[in-house]
């Protein structure tokens, strides 16, 4: 066990043009405050991937408001140091990603808002027990100057971490084969204790409670031999006298379990049993928990309530990602019904309806003909947040109050020339053409198209249209 | 602004389950999570749980394995069932719209008695 | 889950006078996620502060919240008749939210 430790010596911008705009200003004043996450070996995973060597949130910085007309120095930093504590052997090889945050200390709504200035990530080699380590890294126009170290807790010593160290019995030296431990040349090296019944002939450990196997030998105490004679069954010894096994694809093989979780297999496949903090199917998951504050922005921690459980964030509207740390464009989403304008106020969103439209989305439809009379005779039609009177024959206009010009349309075809009249309108049609509005030739045998004309109305007489 | 308002049974026997609704006008339900809180007589504020329009809810532990609550986008309302009633389930319900800003609650309903008893 | 303690219970008390009202939490309230809720009788609660000091909306000022971690105070500079009610504070940092007992206050 040990703790990895980070020192921020500066945040501020690098060198070369194009310096960064401070992110304080004496309208919105802000703090820093940085978060650091560890991943075991040189895994170049996402971001977003689970910190599985642990994670850390740092103590805010003091609050700074940019002096008008400066240029941006470097900001003021959090006290102390990030510490993530590792419960098991110190890898010797890591990824690391800080992240620098700003909470804006303004006048918005719901108090302060947080959001991500820089990341930096990185892939390092490092002993615990060793000095401390620089290192410059640059994120955008952002320059970031740190020191981390990995150091054990007692009694672990070693760059793993994982001998122990226990007070000499004797003052002068150390037991059989055990060497003082340096740099507490007062201790002596402690025999790790393997797990019990581990054979030791055949099997040996690195860390307390394992058994690890000696080549030709294995089983939980390394206390059968490994033949490459025939077995009767397809895996694992035929018998505990002959010591057969033939090598196989076991779920355990491996080790599927990360971060020192311990495989075992089920009839069907493996189960990890993880060390304290970790979790997951694979103990791959890291003991970030609700006590640490990791919801941004007004969310609730669900969950986590110790390092064993998983939290999630449950964010307010107009935030997400697995920390609330991205604003959302709540706007994007189209949540204004029926042509709608969306305005998003950030402690609401607004929709400014179109007209025959109400609701807060704009969702409900007006009965637009309701108080809506439509005069001499005409009848009331909705559609689109718009009332349209369809009127009566002789009138037209919005609501039917004009009297109309039935023969604006010329709607007697061939010639035939319209009069209005009380009752619509009358075409007088051209010789040869006949019909309500003119549209049948008469043929030369003076027989029509149509049946005949009606009775009393010779063909070329003017017709009524009723 | 928002209002809401509680409705349902006032009188539930133990053991059935009990049922309210709150109707929420002046802003869209999809605006926001809705939470339901409790008051014994006389005494403090308990919360019982919230959903959101999407249908994530959250529920108070103690309560969790007869809570149930749901939203009807149609029709702006959100709901609450709580099953296996007993006399200590006798209080005021209030249903609240939980803040935009944070998980604290920005406006109530006026609140409902229901009484357990048989 | 967070336990939040109010104290006192109860608090006699004269219309222009200046009070202090404690709540106290089992475990740190992280980012100041505590609001503060006033309740005359008969009536639903009324949020009064959020984020530990931000006055909600139409809160007269002589309410002020203040206190971070696991201490947090509500003060009213001056008692006005309107104001003896039962006071709540509730954490929001957490699931489960959870409400202080309260403290009443009385007229004395």
């Known amino acids: 066990a040990g703790v990895f430790e980070l020192q921020i010596h500066s945040f501020g911008p690098g060198p070369g043009p194009g310096a960064p705009r401070s992110p304080c200003s004496a309208r919105l004043p802000c703090r820093l405050f940085f978060r650091v996450c560890l991943k075991p070996g040189l895994s170049e995973e996402a971001a977003e991937s689970p910190c599985a060597l642990g994670a850390a949130l740092s103590a805010r910085g003091p609050v700074y408001t940019e002096q008008p007309g400066a240029p941006a120095p470097d900001l003021p930093l959090p006290d102390g140091l990030l510490q993530v504590p590792f419960r098991d052997a110190w890898p010797g090889t890591f990824s690391f990603i800080i992240e620098t945050w700003r909470e804006e200390l303004g006048d918005q709504i719901g108090g302060p808002a947080w959001s991500l200035l820089a990341r930096v990530a990185g892939r390092r080699r490092l002993a615990a027990g060793g000095p401390w380590a620089r290192d410059i890294q640059r994120a955008g126009a952002w320059e970031l100057r740190f020191s981390y170290r990995a150091r054990c807790e007692p009694p672990a010593v070693g760059t793993a971490c994982t001998r122990l160290c226990r007070p000499r019995s004797a003052p002068s030296r150390c037991g059989p084969g055990l060497r003082p431990c340096a740099p507490l040349e007062d201790e002596c090296e402690a025999p790790l204790v393997c797990r019990a019944g581990c054979s030791p002939e055949h099997g040996f450990c690195e860390q307390p409670g394992e058994c690890r196997c000696l080549e030709g030998w294995t089983g939980p105490l390394c206390t059968v031999p490994v033949s490459t004679s025939s077995c009767l069954s397809p895996r694992g010894p035929s018998s505990a006298t002959t010591g057969c096994l033939v090598p196989g694809p076991g779920p355990c093989d491996g080790n599927p379990c990360a971060n020192g979780g311990s495989c075992s297999e089920t009839p069907r496949s493996f189960e990890c049993t993880c060390p304290r903090g970790f979790y997951g199917l694979r103990c791959e998951v890291s003991g970030v928990t609700c006590a640490d504050g990791p919801c941004f922005n007004g969310g609730l921690c669900v969950g986590g309530a110790d390092p064993d459980s998983a939290y999630i964030c449950h964010c307010p509207p107009g935030f997400q990602g697995s920390n609330c740390e991205k604003r959302v464009d709540r706007c994007s989403l189209q949540p204004c019904r029926n042509g709608g304008l969306c305005l998003d106020l950030g402690h609401a969103l607004r929709c400014r309806c179109r007209a025959g439209f109400a609701g807060p989305r704009c969702e409900h439809d007006l009965d637009d003909c309701a108080g809506r009379a439509c005069a001499n005779g005409g009848t009331c039609v909705e559609g689109g947040g718009a009332h349209r009177c369809s009127c009566a024959l002789g009138f037209g206009g919005r609501d039917c109050r004009e009297r109309a010009d039935p023969c604006a349309a010329r709607p007697c075809a061939h010639g035939g020339r319209c009069y209005a009249h009380f009752s619509g309108l009358v075409c007088a049609c051209a010789p040869g053409y006949m019909g309500a509005r003119c549209e049948f030739p008469v043929h030369p045998d003076g027989a029509s198209a149509l049946p005949a004309a009606p009775p009393g109305l010779r063909p070329g007489d003017p017709q009524r249209y009723l | 602004q928002v209002q809401l308002q509680e409705s349902g049974p006032g009188l539930v026997k133990p053991s059935e389950t009990l049922s309210l609704t709150c109707t929420v006008s002046?802003?869209?339900?999809?605006?926001?999570?809705w939470s339901w809180i409790r008051q014994p007589p006389g005494k403090g504020l308990e919360w019982i749980g919230y959903?959101?329009?999407?249908?994530?809810?959250n529920y108070n532990p103690s309560l969790k394995s007869r809570v149930t609550i749901s939203v009807d986008t149609s029709k702006n309302q959100f709901s609450l069932k709580l099953s296996s009633v007993t006399a200590a389930d006798t209080a005021v319900y209030y249903c609240a719209s939980i803040a935009v800003t944070g998980f604290y609650f920005d406006y109530w309903g006026q609140g409902t008695l229901v009484t357990v008893s048989s | 889950e967070i336990v939040l303690t109010q104290s006192p219970g109860t608090l006699s008390l004269s219309p222009g006078e200046r009070v202090t009202l404690s709540c106290r939490a089992s475990?740190?309230?992280?980012?100041?996620?505590l609001a503060w809720y006033q309740q005359r009788p008969g009536q639903a609660p009324r949020l009064l502060i959020y984020?530990?000091?931000s006055r909600a909306t139409g809160i007269p000022d002589r309410f002020s919240g203040s206190g971070s971690g696991t201490d947090f105070t509500l003060t009213i500079s001056r008692l006005e008749p309107e104001d003896f009610a039962v006071y709540y504070c509730?954490?929001?940092?957490?699931?489960?939210?959870?409400f202080g007992g309260g403290t009443k206050l009385e007229i004395k």
């Open positions: 002046g802003g869209s339900i999809s605006s926001y999570y």
């Open positions: 959903v959101y329009y999407s249908g994530t809810t």
């Open positions: 475990q740190r309230v992280n980012n100041n996620y």
């Open positions: 984020g530990a000091s």
């Open positions: 509730q954490q929001y940092d957490r699931s489960p939210l959870t």
